[in-house]
């Protein structure tokens, strides 16, 4: 049961499943917005972002977005609504427990967005081919 | 009724491990409604969170105690432990173990009374 | 990680009057603020959470206000009960942080 101060708070719009109808709780992110990034031909990076915020909605999952240009590397880590684009992109890999990172077509940049559903899992976002999700096995891990 | 109970030994030796247990009586600790974890206050000195979790999602961890904490579980006992290595003097304080809704995290609805720790060889 | 600042350290002030406690965070915690109460020998008790919601059981002449960096938590007239240290604490950013306390004394 839900904890009866808490009621006040937990209005209909707040209670927020998820596929298999488990209530979803506010998430804990990185949110550093975004960043200077050093992070370059790595199967793996961590965000080096010290803050961890909790996401206003329990809808919200963490978010990590990598660009690089001719001029530099930032790393973007936030909440978002997967409901919502973001970027013009939607967040396909939202039930993930790992930030696996997937490239997205922009012009002019290499753009490569992850996404997430388990504390702070935008630290460590990932690059490497062996945790491309046609990976069966993975998919386990995603959806068990 | 949730209640939460700490125990320990209070008095620990420098440099070597604090070991409490909080008890949840009343409930469960697999109830993911509730957040549980651990706040310790020095003598006459303000409140700082050590750790908390929620069932099925990580430990959280203060980072300043620098990976000296350690928060374990045990569902068949009803109970959660914490583990602080290399303890000194600075670490001498009242322990809780507190709960608080998840929907609201990181708020505390109810605390135990707290369990004295005391560093000093 | 957010420092949580509290004035007065010490308010003095006799039964009935009001009590007006400050808390300001050295950057935004939205609207994530809890008040505590705590007695001598006491664990605390949750007052106030998310600026402004009275916890279970909290009586009606305790309230809080504010947003962002500013908050205030309001005893409308006080009860010989009320004497205690007052914390606040943010939850916007993790670790969770508490002030250094508010203590309200009988004059």
């Known amino acids: 049961t839900i904890p009866p101060h808490v009621q006040k708070s937990v209005n209909n719009d707040m209670i927020v499943t998820d596929n298999n109808g488990a209530v979803k709780f506010p998430q804990l992110c990185k949110f550093c917005d975004v960043r200077f990034s050093t992070c370059d031909n790595q199967k793996s990076c961590m965000s080096n972002c010290s803050i961890t915020s909790i996401c206003e909605k329990p809808q919200e999952v963490c978010v990590a977005v990598w660009r690089k240009n001719d001029e530099n590397i930032t790393l973007e880590t936030v909440c978002h609504d997967p409901k919502l684009p973001y970027h013009d992109f939607i967040l396909e890999d939202a039930a993930s427990p790992k930030c696996i990172m997937k490239e997205k077509k922009k012009p002019g940049e290499t753009f490569f967005m992850c996404s997430c559903s388990s504390d702070e899992c935008n630290d460590n976002i990932i690059f490497s081919e062996e945790y491309n999700t046609s990976n069966p096995d993975l998919l386990l891990v995603i959806f068990q | 009724q949730l209640q939460v109970q700490e125990s320990g030994p209070g008095l620990v030796k420098p440099s070597e491990t604090l070991s409490l247990t909080c008890t949840v009586s009343?409930?469960?600790?697999?109830?993911?409604?509730?957040?549980w974890g651990w706040i310790r206050q020095p003598p006459g000195k303000g409140l700082e969170w050590i750790g908390s979790?929620?069932?099925?999602?990580?430990?959280y961890y203060n980072p300043s105690l620098k990976s000296r904490a350690t928060i374990s579980i045990d569902t068949s006992k009803s109970q959660f432990s914490l583990k602080l290595s290399s303890v000194t003097a600075a670490d001498t304080a009242v322990y809780y173990c507190?709960?608080?809704?998840?929907?609201?995290?990181?708020?505390?609805?109810?605390w135990g009374q707290g369990t004295l720790v005391t560093v000093s060889s | 990680e957010i420092v949580l600042t509290q004035s007065p350290a010490t308010l003095s002030l006799s039964p009935g009057e009001r009590a007006t406690l400050s808390c300001r965070a050295s950057q935004s915690v939205r609207s994530y603020l809890a008040w505590y109460q705590q007695k001598p020998g006491q664990a605390p008790r949750l007052l106030i959470y998310?600026?402004?919601n009275r916890a279970t059981g909290i009586p009606a002449r305790f309230s809080g206000s504010g947003s962002g960096t500013d908050f205030t938590l309001t005893i409308s007239s006080l009860e010989p009960e009320d004497f205690a240290v007052y914390y606040c604490?943010?939850?916007?950013?993790?670790?969770?942080?508490f002030g250094q306390g508010t203590k309200v004394e009988i004059k």
């Open positions: 998310d600026a402004s």
């Open positions: 604490q943010q939850r916007s950013n993790w670790p969770p942080t």
């Open positions: 009343g409930g469960s600790i697999s109830n993911s409604y509730f957040s």
């Open positions: 507190p709960r608080g809704p998840t929907m609201i995290r990181g708020v505390i609805d109810s």
């Open positions: 979790f929620y069932y099925g999602e990580k430990t």
